[in-house]
């Protein structure tokens, strides 16, 4: 287990002519946010393929408003790292996809609108535990500067985070074939020490000194891709006589999962689902209690403190498995309707809805009056692909649920005093003025310069505005 971390340093117009002045459209201010997606391997994957290693979304950056005549700056960025937790081994080779999204803050129906501004893809090799790697990438007319690293967490160590170590606080149980982890004292690593040079990524061992290869790899140290052999389509150990791959066990044949774990094949590898009380790549770590912190990815451990009592991990949203070690690709369910964009935030799944739609899954059409009442006697009016509420007197807002103060706009002219009334407002005019808004001056001889006051109303009397 571990976490991939991405730090965005800057995002702005690239050098050269034709660089954009602003990320915002002509509709007004906007702000940026970033999405990072990790996919295993170095192959060029389809953009829409799932982020099998995980994904994360940044917070929104500060609001940006273009300054006329000012040079185009680096744009204000969200604070903090983007973190993508990963379970089990760090693959070492991966595809990194960084998307820059624009949130427009103009007066869109249904709230802000989102659009993809730039997307960069890097296929990289990276060992866990190494220093920050820096990069500069161009996406169209934009330039993105960023750093990234992978680091192990919890009980994992090594360049692939595959070596599991007992925490320092736990009693030392270094048995035969187990040695202290190099960087830390009083900790011992399980699984056993493999043959020197055995690939951390593509090999494993169940007995000290051996090196068994995962599917797709061969050689004494599991460093040779099986596809380089002249015998394609076969899997298993390399034949000493022919150099060809001979039919051999699949990744789950012989069940590499210890302690009653069940094995399932994954592309190029396998995955163990461990029974309660066991965890690790091959369910090899046992005698575990909540004190050992066996629940990954923020899972809540419930169970006794003695080694004989089983524990239960209550997993947070997005994770499953007996130790919350399996990430659920929830966006693959395509829960967002009406063209909404699915974003897995880790703790929550969020649909970014197209303008005119709202709701947890963009299921609600804001553009139509059907089933959408306007409050307080207002009536719903459709038109131009949108709806609006025509509110009764004394009410305002999009749904007519805000009490409108008819006097707020100071409608009474020439010092007239405004009084809110159940059907609107009343202006009490200052001496010398008359009219529903005190807009007409009264001549000294008592005759108004504009239309006369209605019968029964003297100049200076309150005028009710309907």
């Amino acid at each position: 287990a571990g976490v991939f971390e991405l730090q965005i340093h800057s995002f702005g117009p690239g050098p050269g002519p034709g660089a954009p002045r602003s990320p915002c459209s002509a509709r007004g201010p906007c702000r940026l946010f970033f999405r990072v997606c990790l996919k295993p391997g170095l192959s060029e994957e389809a953009a829409e393929s799932p982020c099998a290693l995980g994904a994360a979304l940044s917070a929104r950056g500060p609001v940006y408003t273009e300054q006329p005549e000012a040079p185009a700056p680096d744009l204000p960025l969200p604070n903090g790292l983007l973190q993508v937790p990963f379970r089990d081994a760090w693959p070492g080779t991966f595809s990194l996809i960084i998307e820059t999204w624009r949130e427009e803050l103009g007066d869109q129906i249904g709230g802000p609108a989102w659009s993809l501004l730039a997307r960069v893809t890097r296929r990289r090799r990276l060992a866990a535990g190494g220093p920050w790697a820096r990069d500069i990438q161009r996406a169209g007319a934009w330039e993105l500067r960023f750093s990234y690293r992978a680091r192990c967490e919890l009980l994992a160590v090594g360049t692939a985070c595959t070596r599991l170590c007992r925490p320092r606080s736990a009693p030392s149980r270094c048995g035969p074939g187990l040695r202290p982890c190099a960087p830390l004292e009083d900790e011992c690593e399980a699984p056993p020490v493999c043959r020197a040079g055995c690939s951390l990524e593509h090999g494993f061992c169940e007995q000290p000194g051996e090196c068994r290869c995962l599917e797709g790899w061969t050689g004494p140290l599991c460093t040779v891709p099986a596809s380089t052999s002249s015998c394609l389509g076969l899997r298993g150990p390399s034949s000493a006589t022919t150099g060809c791959l001979v039919p051999g066990p699949g990744p789950c044949d012989g069940n590499p999962c210890a302690n009653g774990g069940s094995c399932s094949e994954t592309p190029g590898s396998f995955e163990c689902t461990c029974p309660r009380g066991f965890y690790g790549l091959r369910c090899e770590v046992s005698g575990v209690t909540c004190a050992d912190g066996p629940c990954f990815n923020g899972g809540l451990c419930v169970g006794g403190a003695d080694p004989d009592s089983a524990y239960i991990c209550h997993c947070p949203p997005g994770f499953q498995g007996s130790n919350c070690e399996k990430r659920v690709d929830r966006c693959s369910l395509q829960p967002c309707r009406n063209g909404g964009l699915c974003l897995d935030l880790g703790h929550a799944l969020r649909c970014r809805c197209r303008a005119g739609f709202a709701g947890p899954r963009c299921e609600h059409n804001l553009d139509d009056c059907a089933g959408r009442a306007c409050a307080n006697g207002g009536t719903c009016v459709e038109g131009g692909g949108a709806h609006r509420c025509s509110c009764a007197l004394g009410f305002g807002g999009r749904d007519c649920r805000e009490r409108a103060d008819p006097c707020a706009a100071r409608p009474c002219a020439h010092g007239g005093r405004c009084y809110a009334h159940f059907s609107g407002l009343v202006c009490a005019c200052a001496p010398g003025y008359m009219g529903s808004r005190c807009e007409f001056p009264v001549h000294p001889d008592g005759v108004s310069a504009l239309p006369a006051a209605p019968p029964g109303l003297r100049p200076g009397d309150p005028q009710r505005y309907l």
Epitope: P317, C336, L345, H347, A348, L349, R350, P360, E363
Partner: antibody, heavy 118, light 112 residues
């Protein structure tokens, strides 16, 4: 730990207004929609409406459109239900619940009992 | 509005028995684009708030015992408890989240 903590019981007069609160903790308030649900004895659960705290958009069941108003304060991670012109039919337990795009009402508040009585 | 109907309104069973309760919606809850049913089941024990049991019609919530199973598609759905335990005494509600939100009237499970 994810929690939705609701305000205490209310005894109100007919025709009055009441404001109930639902304070969220243990998760990012802006990433979840907050719903309000009414429960009367033997009448099951009635959905009132939801609010998206990120932008303040609220949607209501038309039946509650004139009676209820939902607001949210992101600075305090609190959602509010405003009930107006209460009658005896407003006597009920009111629950808040959170929802994201994957899970429906995964977390619920403990409920607030509102009693409308002269 | 989508109307949700539950049956039976109540039932009494002995511990260890299998229980089936049904929920019917007035229109289909199956979204063709993802072939998912926007239906959930909740359990409400006496004096407590409702608790999510099943979502997407058949996905069991984390921590819910595997004796609870949701099934069905379109307009007809079922919640099955394979072997009832005393702690399952509760009212069970179905809910659609396809459009707005509506709940069924509930099925009250009593233990003989």
């Amino acid at each position: 730990e994810v929690q939705l903590q609701q305000s205490g019981a209310e005894l109100v007069r007919p025709g009055a207004l009441v404001k109930l609160s639902c304070k969220a903790s243990g998760f990012n308030f802006k990433d979840y929609y907050i719903h309000w649900v009414k429960q009367r004895p033997e009448l099951g659960l009635e959905w009132i409406g939801w609010i998206d705290p990120e932008n303040g958009n609220a949607i209501y069941d038309p039946k509650f459109q004139d009676k209820a108003s939902i607001t949210a304060d992101t600075s305090s991670n609190t959602a509010y239900l405003h009930l107006s012109s209460l009658t005896s039919e407003g006597t009920a337990v009111y629950y808040c619940a959170s929802e994201d795009a994957y899970y429906p009402f995964a977390y619920w508040g403990q409920g607030t009992l509102v009693t409308v009585s002269a | 509005d989508i109307v949700m109907s539950q049956s039976p309104s109540s039932l009494a069973v002995s511990v260890g028995e299998k229980v089936t309760m049904r929920c019917k919606s007035s229109q289909s809850l199956l979204y063709s684009s993802n072939q998912k049913n926007y239906l959930a089941w909740y359990q409400q024990k006496p004096g407590q708030s409702p608790k999510l049991l099943i979502y997407w019609a058949s996905t069991r919530e984390s921590g819910v015992p595997d004796r609870f199973t949701g099934s069905g598609s379109g307009t007809d759905f079922t919640l099955t408890i394979s072997s009832v335990k005393a702690e399952d005494l509760a009212v069970y509600f179905c809910q659609q989240y396809y459009s707005y939100r509506t709940f069924g009237g509930g099925t009250k499970l009593e233990i003989k």
